[in-house]
Amino acid sequence: VPPGEDSKDVAAPHRQPLTSSERIDKQIRYILDGISALRKETCNKSNMCESSKEALAENNLNLPKMAEKDGCFQSGFNEETCLVKIITGLLEFEVYLEYLQNRFESSEEQARAVQMSTKVLIQFLQKKAKNLDAITTPDPTTNASLLTKLQAQNQWLQDMTTHLILRSFKEFLQSSLRALRQM
């Protein structure tokens, strides 16, 4: 131990420590609760949650989605392919979570918590992944211009974008949760 430092171990008591799978499960449920809180504000503020014009705005967004080829569904389940898809998808969602940061008045802290807890989840999952080379990180320049483009939209489109991000992120996490429980 270097001078000026003190190292003290924490000994585990009789209670079983959390496993990697349990902790990841809890982290996803934590984020899902956060999304519910944010969706509540979005739905109270506008009528986006009942809107039928979603397809209009969805064309502008390239939100990550689970597909059959990703190996996360029961048919054709592939643990390694699926884990890569989950991590890649979460990394792609990060720019959209950044966009959400200025979109909430009364839930500003909750939006930040959703963003940060997603970063934590990515870390947990990266520890679990064997094939980190297969994970492509989004290009920062592309993300920056996407963010600028999203922030330049009119108010209605911004509200719709917020609603769609939250809905897609929720669906992606729910699919991830189901898949991870099979691993």
């Epitope: 924490v10 585990a12 420590p17 934590y30 918590a113 807890s117």
Partner: nanobody, 125 residues
Framework: GGGGLVQPGGSLRLSCAAS????????IGWFRQAPGKEREGVSC????????YYADSVKGRFTISRDNAKNTVYLQMNSLKPEDTAVYYC????????????????????????WGQGTQVTVSS
Amino acid sequence: GGGGLVQPGGSLRLSCAASGFTLDYYGIGWFRQAPGKEREGVSCISSSDWSTYYADSVKGRFTISRDNAKNTVYLQMNSLKPEDTAVYYCAAGTWDLKFGYNRSNCVRSAEYDYWGQGTQVTVSS
């Protein structure tokens, strides 16, 4: 070991490592107990969103951080005062796993399941 005597105004970094489980899965708190006094919560850091909390008595002087790669949590203590003299403990718990948890609750002993054995810090000239 490692704690010991520090002069007023001095600095010390305490580190908390875990044996037998993954520290980054838990909310971590630092507590201290001065002779004849109750154990008090000093600072804590969440495992869910890395948010931090500090007791008023240490705000601006102490910094809590985690290094998940090293499975270690640190408490950097600057501008130490004689009243910081105490036995310091780190603890791990699951107080932060419910979204919307009350951050200030993390300095309550009851929120923790795992405790370190403590280290003496004495601030004196």
